[in-house]
C-alpha cells in the first residue's frame, strides 16, 4: 500500500505502466492495478475471460473490505448474502433469503416469522388488548328511561396489533341485552309524537302484548291490550338479566 | 454452533518450546482467517499472530516474530501455534479467535506459563 | 502501532445508572472500532461493530458512537449481568491494537 512497495514491485513487473490510472500505486497494461494507494481497496473485476485489477474507495455490493499489512482487498460475502461486515456478519441478504442473526436464511427458524419489507426473521407478535371498559348505559333507540328491553355495550382497546403469524384480536366490542331503568322519561326526551309512532311489529318469540312505550307509561289510564300486570314484569326482568346475550365484533 | 477448543498450554522454563493447538468445529473453518489472541494475569488482550484462510500469508506483532509460528490444516479444521524461545512476558492466556476485522468467536484459552 | 487509550480504567456504579466509557485512537481510524465485554475466566465477547453496529442478541440498552480519534461505549441503564471488563480495539490498521480495558464495578 506504500509507496517503497509500489516502487519495488515496479522494478519486478516487466509490463508496468508508469501512468496508472485513478487510485492505483502500480498497474500494467494487460492486468490493470496490481496494488493501490493507501486506504483504497484492491478487487478484481472480470472482463469477459480477463481478470482487472482496480482499486477502489469502498468495495462493491457483496464484499466487504479487509486491510491486511501487506494489501487492503475486497473479500467475497458469503453467496447468500448481499451486504456484510463480514463473512460472520450479514447485514442485508440476497432476494429470496431472510436475514437473522447475521446469517441468510431461506426459512425463518420455529417462532420467527418472515418480514417480506426488511426481508428479516422477525418475533412473532400476538395481539394484546386492554381490559374492558364498564359497560354503557342501558338505551332503547337512544333512550335511557322508559320501562323496556334496550341494550348496553362495553368496548376494549387493542394495545399491540399482531403480526402475520401472531393470535388474532379477541372482540373489542360486546353488547348484551338489559333493561332500561324504570324512570319516567322528561319531557326532553320523549320520542316521536303519538301519531308518527307505529306500533312495532313484536320480535320473534315475543309477547303479542308488547312492552309499553314510553308515552303509553307516562299516561296515568292503561290501555287493556297494552297493560301487562306487575308480576309478568317481575317475570320478564328476571328472564332479561339471564338472557344477557352477547354480540362480538372480531378484528 | 462454533465451537473454539486450545489445548497446550502448561508450564514451561524460559528458552523452551510449546505448542499450542486450537480445534475448530462448526463452521467452515478454511473460509476463515485465524488468530491467536493473548492475555496476560490482570492485563489487557494483545494480538500475537493471523494467518489468512488458506495458509498463504501469515502476520505477526513484532515481540513474537522471528519466535512464534501460526500455521493450519483445513483437512483437520485446525490452528496451531509454535512458540519458540520463550521469555517470561510471553506468559498468558492464549486463546484463538476468528479474525475477519473483528474477532468474532474465540476458544475459553489455554494458560501458558513461562518460569524458571 | 496505533494505540488505544481507554478511560476510566475502573468504575463503579449502580444497577439502573447510564454508564459512558470513551476509548481514544492515537491516530485516525475511521469508523473501524469495535467493543468487546469479558466476564472474569470467561474469553471476550464482541459487542458492538463499525463504531455503532450492534452484534445480534446484544441489548439495545448498549450503544456506540464517536468517529475518527474518539469514540464512547454507552450503557443506557446497568443491569446486573453489565459488569464485567469492557475493551475497545480497532481494525483500521496491523497489528490490530485493543484498549487497555475498563472494569465496571457494582458501587
Known amino acids: 500500500q506504500n509507496a517503497s512497495r509500489g516502487r519495488r514491485q515496479r522494478r519486478m513487473h516487466p509490463n508496468v505502466s508508469q501512468g496508472c490510472q485513478g487510485g492505483c500505486a502500480t498497474c500494467s497494461d494487460y492486468n490493470g492495478c496490481l496494488s493501490c494507494k493507501p486506504r483504497l481497496f484492491f478487487a478484481l473485476e472480470r472482463i469477459g475471460m480477463k481478470q482487472i485489477g482496480v482499486c477502489l474507495s469502498s468495495c462493491p455490493s457483496g464484499y466487504y473490505g479487509t486491510r491486511y499489512p501487506d494489501i487492503n482487498k475486497c473479500t467475497k460475502c458469503k453467496a447468500d448474502c448481499d451486504t456484510c461486515f463480514n463473512k460472520n456478519f450479514c447485514t442485508k441478504c440476497k432476494s429470496g433469503f431472510y436475514l437473522h442473526l447475521g446469517k441468510c436464511l431461506d426459512n425463518c427458524p420455529e417462532g420467527l416469522e418472515a418480514n417480506n419489507h426488511t426481508m428479516e426473521c422477525v418475533s412473532i407478535v400476538h395481539c394484546e388488548v386492554s381490559e374492558w371498559n364498564p359497560w354503557s348505559p342501558c338505551t332503547k333507540k337512544g333512550k335511557t328511561c322508559g320501562f323496556k328491553r334496550g341494550t348496553e355495550t362495553r368496548v376494549r382497546e387493542i394495545i399491540q396489533h399482531p403480526s402475520a403469524k401472531g393470535n388474532l384480536c379477541p372482540p373489542t366490542n360486546e353488547t348484551r341485552k338489559c333493561t332500561v331503568q324504570r324512570k319516567k322519561c322528561q319531557k326532553g326526551e320523549r320520542g316521536k309524537k303519538g301519531r308518527e309512532r307505529k306500533r312495532k311489529k313484536p320480535n320473534k318469540g315475543e309477547s303479542k302484548e308488547a312492552i309499553p312505550d314510553s308515552k303509553s307509561l307516562e299516561s296515568s289510564k292503561e290501555i287493556p291490550e297494552q297493560r301487562e300486570n306487575k308480576q309478568q314484569q317481575k317475570k320478564r326482568k328476571v328472564q332479561d338479566k339471564q338472557k344477557s346475550v352477547s354480540v362480538s365484533t372480531v378484528h | 454452533e462454533v465451537q473454539l477448543v486450545e489445548s497446550g498450554g502448561g508450564v514451561v522454563q524460559p528458552g523452551r518450546s510449546l505448542r499450542l493447538s486450537c480445534a475448530a468445529s462448526?463452521?467452515?473453518?478454511?473460509?476463515?482467517?485465524m488468530a491467536w489472541v493473548r492475555q496476560a494475569p490482570g492485563k489487557g488482550l494483545e494480538w500475537v499472530a493471523t494467518i489468512i484462510y488458506d495458509g498463504s500469508r501469515t502476520y505477526y506483532r513484532d515481540s513474537v516474530k522471528g519466535r512464534f509460528t501460526i500455521s493450519r490444516d483445513n483437512s483437520k479444521n485446525t490452528l496451531y501455534l509454535q512458540m519458540n524461545s520463550l521469555r517470561a512476558e510471553d506468559t498468558a492466556v492464549y486463546y484463538c479467535?476468528?479474525?475477519?476485522?473483528?474477532?468474532?468467536?474465540w476458544g475459553q484459552g489455554t494458560m501458558v506459563t513461562v518460569s524458571s | 502501532d496505533i494505540q488505544m487509550t481507554q478511560s476510566p480504567s475502573s468504575l463503579s456504579a449502580s444497577v439502573g445508572d447510564r454508564v459512558t466509557i470513551t476509548c481514544r485512537a492515537s491516530?485516525?481510524?475511521?469508523?473501524?472500532l469495535a467493543w468487546y465485554q469479558q466476564k472474569p475466566g470467561k474469553a471476550p465477547k464482541l459487542l458492538i461493530y463499525d463504531v455503532n453496529s450492534l452484534i445480534h442478541g446484544v441489548p439495545s440498552r448498549f450503544s456506540g458512537s464517536g468517529s475518527g480519534t474518539d469514540f464512547t461505549l454507552t450503557i443506557s441503564s446497568l443491569q446486573p449481568e453489565d459488569f464485567a471488563t469492557y475493551f475497545c480495539?480497532?481494525?483500521?490498521?496491523?497489528?490490530?491494537?485493543f484498549g487497555q480495558g475498563t472494569k465496571l464495578e457494582i458501587k
Open positions: 462448526g463452521f467452515t473453518f478454511s473460509d476463515y482467517d
Open positions: 479467535a476468528t479474525h475477519d476485522k473483528t474477532f468474532d468467536y
Open positions: 491516530e485516525d481510524i475511521y469508523s473501524d
Open positions: 480495539q480497532q481494525y483500521d490498521n496491523y497489528p490490530n491494537t
